[in-house]
């Protein structure tokens, strides 16, 4: 960075609030889509180019002028695996976090024309190509349809779909948000013969109802009703089916074969939590009890003689936790070998660290192929010779990410493929492999500017730089940018990591106001090596505020001892640890302990509120955006994973003594800004409404802002700008800044 150590002598502009809100300085991505083991698609100036990975040469796959006469704004595209057709998505209408409806048309790349017959209906909820060829499965009005050819009529697979009641091939609200992180509940077999799907029944699930005010001209607000199981309420039920798409006919109804949950699940409420095809005729299903410390994997084979699916009890694999819950958020997915007779899976080892274990389908026990006081983040690819994974092993930094490969014939032969490529600039990698893992794109997202490179798996040599953000680098040379410090403190003989966004020309002999940016939910991580341009960048650069984050007990990727510390006790240690972190930061000598603030969104809003309501005396003020205020208000799947059930026999006492409302009196000692969107389908406005009521009831003066018709993201352009401007004013006022 050019300039000088002396802030007064540095005439460069700072990174302003407007820079953040208007996205003045844009990080360039390099988003590719692999279409084979050696080719990928990349969108450039709205042309779709096809690149050869080995040589880097490209040709135009589809010109931007192709759809000039289309008459619709194309939101997204998807090319069939055989490269013959392109699915065009338009009329996109967002629903929840992942779900949306849209219209679709199919363009024949050979005939260079749109297919006009037997079109997919408007308001389709999900569409997906088969993994090979060009079959299509889609969901419309909660029912599943299959197209064998894009120009042929659809075959209807299900007939039971009913809005808000029966969902075939798509998730209901809670499965979308908390289980599959997707709207889709359809899974093609590898060659597209079978289509597996889940059916969710929300008949008995209570509805959350909230007003949607819409346009000013709407005299009576609309009421939105969503089946949403809160903690302890009636949950959706699930069934699982497989249909053979080769047997579909217009004149007879499709026969879907049900695969029932294991007996150990059927004894009570349970979830379907993972579906993975092992081979063309073998599928693995993972089921999870409502009390999420016990899961079962079933491995089911197709019996051609009966047309049924058999799941042998001898092939069941049980995964359980005695200290908390199974998985980070749910049981991890298996990665099967080519023959389908064995698989690799991330599970907790004896020491409570998540590592890769090798399973044979007919054996109960598995063999760990990685070990150490670090964690495997994800399995990224599996070939006949190697398994590729991302971990945070390197230099013992939980907030780093690197790509490794392990030799399957000798587990001692492990190579870090990314660690030494650019160690100063790049410490946080993700990866995208080609279809058979012959090539991979490394995406480095920090601590330096993002860097995208292409590599060959044959010799792990770098082939070329795809994007280095050099243009942005040049622009930022003229800006007084903050620096980022990543370090740890030791509490009770345990390392706890924090990050600080430090103002330009940071001088440790000076005193700075500090804002603690908190999330602190189970398995969260806020201290990492990622480069970001965000609100904190502005606060540090322009307002000279230190923005710190701390990963205390409950945080992830450092072993279950830390993560499971808050099991059945949300609102305790993770809250206390944020307060303790602020105390530790105060002792570092460069923090003005009269000007410490805290802010957070969602779970972070809950922790912020609990911290401010603790009466610690550490914090002057804080902002809670869309906070949870009482765990009985939040959804069953997330809440019960950590808290169990709100019943006297289980954990009702702690549900009741972990509310924000019970701390209302202590808010007299702090300045509090409470913000919520009125159309938040996730953390309901109810949660802030109850905080507000409790504060009013005890005579606390506080500030509040609602965002009409905004959901949990408060992400519309105007609302996003308004909320950050409003929060900036609040923080500046709190810190007595001009």
């Amino acid at each position: 960075n050019k300039g000088t150590d002396d802030a007064t002598a540095d005439s460069r502009k700072t990174y302003t609030l407007t820079d953040y809100l208007k996205n003045t300085y844009r990080l360039k991505l390099y988003s590719l889509r692999w279409i084979s083991d050696h080719e990928y698609l990349y969108k450039q100036e709205n042309n779709i180019l096809v690149f050869n990975a080995e040589y880097g040469n490209s040709s135009v796959f589809l010109e931007n002028s192709t759809f000039d006469e289309f008459g619709h704004s194309i939101n997204d595209y998807s090319i069939s695996p055989d490269g013959q057709f392109i699915l065009l998505e338009y009329n996109y209408v967002k629903q929840w976090r992942h779900s949306y409806t849209a219209s679709y048309d199919i363009y024949d790349l050979n005939k260079r024309q749109l297919i006009t017959e037997e079109r997919i209906p408007n308001n389709t909820q999900w569409v997906t190509w088969s993994p090979v060829g060009h079959k299509l499965a889609y969901v419309w009005n909660n029912d599943i349809y299959v197209k064998i050819e894009p120009n042929l009529p659809s075959y209807r697979i299900t007939w039971t779909g009913k809005e808000d009641i029966i969902y075939n091939g798509i998730t209901d609200w809670v499965y979308e948000e908390e289980v599959f992180s997707a709207y889709s509940a359809l899974w093609w077999s590898p060659n597209g013969t079978f289509l597996a799907y889940a059916q969710f029944n929300d008949t008995e699930v209570p509805l959350i109802e909230y007003s949607f005010y819409s346009d000013e001209s709407l005299q009576y607000p609309k009421t939105v009703r969503v089946p949403y199981p809160k903690a302890g309420a009636v949950n959706p039920t699930v069934k699982f089916f497989v249909v053979n798409t080769d047997s579909l006919s217009s004149v007879t109804n499709a026969t879907s074969i049900q695969i029932t949950a294991p007996a150990s699940m059927l004894i009570g409420d349970h979830y379907l939590c993972d579906v993975t095809w092992a081979t063309q005729e073998r599928i693995s299903l993972q089921w999870l009890r409502r009390i999420q410390n016990y899961s079962v994997m079933d491995i089911c084979d197709y019996d051609e003689s009966s047309g049924r699916w058999n799941c042998l009890v001898a092939r069941q694999h049980i995964e359980m936790s005695t200290t908390g819950w199974v998985g980070r958020f749910r049981p991890s997915e298996p990665h099967f070998t080519l023959d389908g007779n064995s698989f690799y899976k991330i599970i907790s080892n004896e020491e409570g660290y998540r590592h890769i274990c090798y399973f044979q389908i007919d054996k109960k026990d598995c063999t760990f192929i990685t070990k150490g006081t670090w964690e495997v983040i994800g399995i990224e690819a599996l070939t006949s010779d190697y398994l590729y994974y991302i971990s945070n092993e390197y230099k013992g930094m939980p907030g780093g990410r690197n790509l490794y490969k392990i030799q399957l014939s000798d587990y001692t032969k492990v190579t870090c493929l990314s660690c030494e490529l650019n160690p100063e600039r790049c410490q946080y990698y993700s990866v995208s492999f080609s279809k058979e893992a012959k090539y991979y794109q490394l995406r480095c997202s920090g601590p330096g500017l993002p860097l995208y490179t292409l590599h060959s798996s044959v010799n792990d040599k770098g082939l070329r730089v795809l994007e280095d953000n050099s243009a942005l680098d040049k622009m930022l040379q003229n800006v007084q940018m903050p620096s980022k410090k990543l370090d740890f403190i030791i509490l009770n003989e345990t390392k706890f990591w924090y990050q600080m966004i430090l103002p330009p020309h940071f001088d440790k002999s000076k005193k700075y106001p500090l804002l603690l940016d908190v999330y602190a939910g189970p398995c969260s991580q806020k201290a990492d090596t990622v480069f970001r341009l965000n609100w904190a960048t502005y606060l540090a650069s322009t307002e000279n505020i230190i923005v710190a984050s701390f990963d205390g007990r409950g945080s992830g990727y450092q072993g279950d001892k830390i993560m499971h510390a808050i099991n059945r006790r949300l609102g305790t240690f993770e809250v206390e640890d944020q307060i303790e972190a602020a105390r530790q930061f105060s002792k570092m000598g460069f923090v003005d302990n009269k000007r410490i603030a805290i802010w957070g969104w969602s779970y972070g809003g809950y922790v912020t509120s609990m911290v401010l309501g603790s009466g610690s005396g550490v914090f002057k003020c804080g902002i809670a955006v869309a906070p949870v205020s009482r765990w009985e208000y939040y959804d069953s799947v997330y809440t019960e994973r950590y808290m169990g059930l709100p019943t006297p026999e289980d954990n009702l006492d702690h549900y009741r003594n972990s509310t924000v409302m019970s701390r209302a009196e202590n808010f007299k000692q702090v300045e509090y800004l409470l913000i919520h969107g009125t159309a938040d389908d996730n953390v309901h406005f109810q949660q802030s409404a109850q905080i507000s009521k409790a504060l009013v009831d005890v005579g606390v003066d506080f500030q509040a802002m609602w965002y009409t018709d905004e959901d949990h993201g408060i992400a519309s352009s105007t609302a996003h700008q308004h909320i950050y401007t409003h929060m900036s004013h609040f923080i500046k006022q709190c810190f007595s800044l001009p």
Epitope: E117, E118, I148, E149, N151, L152, P153, Y155, N244, D246, S247, L248, S249, S250, V251, T252, T255, E304, S305, S306, G307
Partner: antibody, heavy 116, light 107 residues
Framework: EVQLVESGAGVKQPGGTLRLTCTAS????????VHWVRQAPGKGLEWVGV???????DYDAAFMSRVTISKDTSKSTVYLQMNSLRAEDTAVYYC??????????WGQGTTVTVSS | DIQMTQSPSSLSASLGDRVTITCSAS??????LNWYQQKPDGAVKLLIY???NLHSGVPSRFSGSGSGTDFSLTISNLEPEDIATYYC?????????FGSGTKLEIK
């Protein structure tokens, strides 16, 4: 390779019973339906009925009362039984595989003559 | 039942000719129409499914078109091996029904 082979040809007595066998190979009878069609001498093709992959059956109304289609998946065979035979049942009988909404593979046909 | 009417019942054409056979349905069947070829030895093969889709392995000189009630099969360049009887068949509704056939001969 997909193949269908009909057998059971011969001369049948009027009023008697016909039982034809279709032996399938190269595909599963639990996945694909198998149809029967017949062709009287010098005439066109006439659909008789189908047995679907899941074992359900459908028949032309003209044959409903005297035709039964069944299968033995372990032997990969489909059967056509026709009772109360009459002279007009004399025909070449074909079995064929159902692929979605068309017949993609046909047997070579088997000739049945109904005569006293 | 849906009646299928085929015409002509027979036709004679020269090698290399373009030949068209038509088929009409007694009610609308959208595009649910298939064409089959029956050789003189009785062997039957699928040519076209769903009105216009060529079955794998069928020469590209065969093409199909039409929707609703009127359909046609065209052979663009007649070859000696095309001597056969051609049948249309509707697949929209049970019972499936066939046209009466068109016998194609070489002049």
């Amino acid at each position: 390779e997909v193949q269908l082979v009909e057998s059971g040809a011969g001369v049948k007595q009027p009023g008697g019973t016909l039982r034809l066998t279709c032996t399938a190979s190269g595909f599963s009878l639990t996945t694909y339906g198998v149809h029967w069609v017949r062709q009287a001498p010098g005439k066109g093709l006439e659909w008789v009925g189908v047995i679907w992959g899941d074992g359900r059956t459908d028949y032309d109304a003209a044959f409903m009362s005297r035709v039964t289609i069944s299968k033995d998946t372990s032997k990969s065979t489909v059967y056509l039984q026709m009772n109360s035979l009459r002279a007009e049942d004399t025909a070449v009988y074909y079995c064929m595989r159902n692929r979605h909404d068309w017949f993609d593979y046909w047997g070579q046909g088997t000739t049945v003559t109904v005569s006293s | 039942d849906i009646q299928m009417t085929q015409s002509p019942s027979s036709l004679s054409a020269s090698l290399g000719d373009r030949v068209t056979i038509t088929c009409s349905a007694s009610q609308g069947i959208r595009n649910s129409l298939n064409w089959y070829q029956q050789k003189p030895d009785g062997a039957v093969k699928l040519l076209i499914y769903y009105s216009s889709n060529l079955h794998s392995g069928v020469p590209s000189r065969f093409s199909g078109s039409g929707s609703g009630t009127d359909f046609s099969l065209t052979i663009s360049n007649l070859e000696p091996e095309d001597i056969a009887t051609y049948y249309c068949q509707q697949s929209i509704k049970l019972p499936f029904t066939f046209g009466s056939g068109t016998k194609l001969e070489i002049k």
